[in-house]
């Protein structure tokens, strides 16, 4: 009777997280390789061998101007190179885009900045979140997030707080006060409007998100921290 | 000799012209086919909003969906029966969680909540099957042999799983795999 269980909640599908994501490999080199070959042909056309000395003399007689046929050939050669490169890029890129369902029609919402979250961070509502596992003091957490080019977790609205509370345990947030006589402020120096429980305790001057609510805690105590970076 | 050279350049120009034309038509066909193919998708889907990122193959997800390791997850706040959960995920162009390893929801490993997953017992195959018809790996849940085959499976991201009446109400997570 050792059934593993303790709660109500939710689930999801899977894949191997360690699997390397597929990237269109080698497209750059293959294109440049082809370009090299075509440029080589072009150079050969532009540098006639010794057998072509006669034509050079004719050019001299015509005031060093190449015949229009050569000029046309050179222009068409360049066009060919450009077209060839475009075709190759298209051949490489189209299956990749299809594989990722990338099309104008998939943009169902107002256009917004793409993810760019570091690996192993999560994205939610135009923000990246680092889900920490280590325990640190409030100040150490602040520095740890700064070193990750982000900020200690901030709560922008009730909806975000509910979401975070559903997946995270207690966590430091970027809100503090200098003493119980001072107001709660964010790490950006803005006044913090939401209610923080236990604010009357003079020893508790840093804020914590704890299952759907905010409470004060001792800044020197060790807690899990999470970082946030807005996109 | 000059006439021969002129003729040679004309020949080269003509050949290059034909090559250019064929390349242009190839390009046109490629682009036409690809955009026709890509445009088959409906203009609005309630599932994840897919946008290619510049620096990775991953894509971003729709509002209120969580993006993690190139997947989008919808974490419900409501409790539903297993069947209701399955249908709600389907309506979002996604499905209930199919696990290939227990650290898929690593970002939620501290959660102490359980979620319906897309696993049910098939009398026909006498096996626990995922929604896509694939069989449950025996290494995923060591206790799966004790599961009541009439029940559905609830899972905690910490790695715990248990069987519960499919009529029980649990929260659920929908997943859409992007790659």
């Amino acid at each position: 009777m050792n059934k593993q269980r303790g709660t109500f909640s939710e689930v999801s599908l899977a894949q191997d997280p360690k699997r390397q994501q597929r990237k269109p490999k080698g497209n750059k080199s293959s294109i440049s390789g082809t370009e090299q070959e075509i440029f080589q042909v072009e150079l050969n056309l532009q540098n006639p061998s010794l057998n072509h000395q006669g034509i050079d003399k004719i050019y001299d007689c015509q005031g060093l101007l190449p015949p229009p046929e050569k000029l046309t050939a050179e222009v068409l050669g360049i066009i060919c190179i450009v077209l060839m490169a475009t075709v190759l890029k298209t051949i490489v890129l189209i299956p990749f885009l299809e594989q990722n369902n990338f099309s104008p029609n998939t943009r169902t919402q107002k256009a917004r900045h793409c993810g760019h979250c570091p690996e192993e961070w999560i994205t939610y509502s135009n923000s990246c979140y680092y889900i920490g596992k280590e325990r640190r003091t409030w100040e150490e957490s602040l520095l740890a997030c700064t070193s990750k080019n982000s900020s200690l977790l901030s709560i922008d609205n009730e909806e975000e707080m509910k979401f975070l509370a559903s997946i995270l345990p207690s966590s430091w947030i970027g809100v503090f006060r200098n003493s119980s006589h001072h107001p709660w402020v964010t790490i950006n120096g803005l006044a913090f409007k939401h209610k923080i429980k236990d604010s009357d305790n003079a020893e508790l001057n840093c804020a914590v998100l704890q299952v759907n609510r905010l409470k004060s805690a001792q800044c020197g105590s060790s807690m899990i921290y999470h970082c946030k970076h807005k996109l | 000799m000059a006439v021969f050279k002129t003729t040679l350049w004309r020949l080269i120009s003509g050949t290059l012209g034909i090559i250019c034309l064929s390349l242009m038509s190839t390009l046109g066909i490629l682009l036409k086919n690809s955009f026709t193919k890509l445009s088959i998708e409906p203009a609005f889907t309630p599932g994840p909003n897919i946008e290619l990122q510049k620096d990775s193959d991953c894509c971003s997800c729709q509002e209120k969906w969580v993006g993690y390791r190139c997947n989008c997850y919808f974490i419900s706040s409501e409790q539903k029966t297993w069947n209701e959960s399955r249908h709600l995920c389907a309506s979002q162009k996604s499905s209930l969680l199919q696990l290939q390893n227990t650290d898929e929801l690593d970002f939620m490993s501290s959660s102490q909540q359980f979620y319906w997953i897309g696993l049910s017992y098939s009398e026909e195959h006498t096996a626990w099957l995922w929604e896509n018809g694939s069989a449950l790996s025996q290494y995923l849940f060591p206790s799966f042999e004790t599961f009541n085959t009439k029940n559905c499976i609830a899972y905690n991201p910490n790695g715990n799983a248990l069987d519960e009446s499919c009529e029980d109400k649990n929260r659920y997570i929908c997943k859409q795999q992007l790659i």
């Epitope: 009777m1 050792n2 059934k3 593993q4 269980r5 303790g6 709660t7 109500f8 345990p169 207690s170 299952v211 807690m223 | 409790q79 029966t81 501290s110 102490q112 909540q113 359980f114 029940n151 910490n158 715990n160 069987d163 519960e164 009446s165 499919c166 009529e167 029980d168 109400k169």
Partner: antibody, heavy 120, light 107 residues
Framework: EVQLVESGGGLVQPGGSLRLSCAAS????????MNWVRQAPGKGLEWVST????????YYADSVKGRFTISRDNSKDTLYLQMNSLRAEDTAVYYC?????????????WGQGTLVTVSS | DIQMTQSPSSVSASVGDRVTITCRAS??????LAWYQQKSGKAPKLLIY???SLQIGVPSRFSGSGSGTDFTLTISSLQPEDFATYYC?????????FGQGTKLEIK
């Protein structure tokens, strides 16, 4: 305000039966798992049984399995514990407890308890 | 079944003291642990859940820590109303099990 009120306890002979009830109020009863926990006189706490929010899944301690049955009536916001084949060691205060919203394994509200005495 | 062992079984302390009670699980339970306070003749009261989360309405002088097999309940500055019996409980798997209790008495 959450309230849980147990009833149905009393003196019963070994081998006898008793049905405990727990009337719940102040929360959405049908959304939470419910539990019975007991405490023998002068002893510690012992988990007895858990029932899921819909009543479809039940769990029992080995010491009561096959003798006790937990059930619920969500239309009446009431939890029950049917106790059969009672033994002297079942003598205890029986508490009805609500599962915590964060995790059903924690008990955030408890009733005042009802005493069950099994004695001849 | 997972066994929960509390220590000490009883402790004497004075108002204002800092008190620590420990609880050890016979196998790893991650952070699936709760602490309850029970006063004589009363129902238990949830103090801490998920090892370190303070239940709403519980004074902040109570704190919990630990993960895996070793857990601690700390009362930073003992108040007169804190003298009671404290129980830990694992919620990792069925059957849920409680520690034997730690009685906190006035010195």
């Amino acid at each position: 305000e959450v309230q849980l009120v147990e009833s149905g306890g009393g003196l019963v002979q070994p081998g006898g039966s008793l049905r405990l009830s727990c009337a719940a109020s102040g929360f959405t009863f049908s959304s939470y798992a419910m539990n019975w926990v007991r405490q023998a006189p002068g002893k510690g706490l012992e988990w007895v049984s858990t029932i899921s929010n819909s009543g479809g899944t039940t769990y029992y301690a080995d010491s009561v399995k096959g003798r006790f049955t937990i059930s619920r009536d969500n239309s009446k916001d009431t939890l029950y514990l049917q106790m059969n084949s009672l033994r002297a060691e079942d003598t205890a205060v029986y508490y009805c407890a609500k599962a915590h919203y964060y995790a059903r394994g924690y008990f955030d509200y408890w009733g005042q308890g009802t005493l069950v005495t099994v004695s001849s | 079944d997972i066994q929960m062992t509390q220590s000490p079984s009883s402790v004497s302390a004075s108002v204002g003291d800092r008190v620590t009670i420990t609880c050890r699980a016979s196998q790893g339970i991650s952070s699936w642990l709760a602490w309850y306070q029970q006063k004589s003749g009363k129902a238990p009261k949830l103090l801490i859940y998920a090892a370190s989360s303070l239940q709403i309405g519980v004074p902040s002088r109570f704190s919990g820590s630990g993960s895996g097999t070793d857990f601690t309940l700390t009362i930073s500055s003992l108040q007169p109303e804190d003298f009671a019996t404290y129980y830990c409980q694992q919620a990792n798997s069925f059957p849920y099990t409680f520690g034997q209790g730690t009685k906190l008495e006035i010195k």
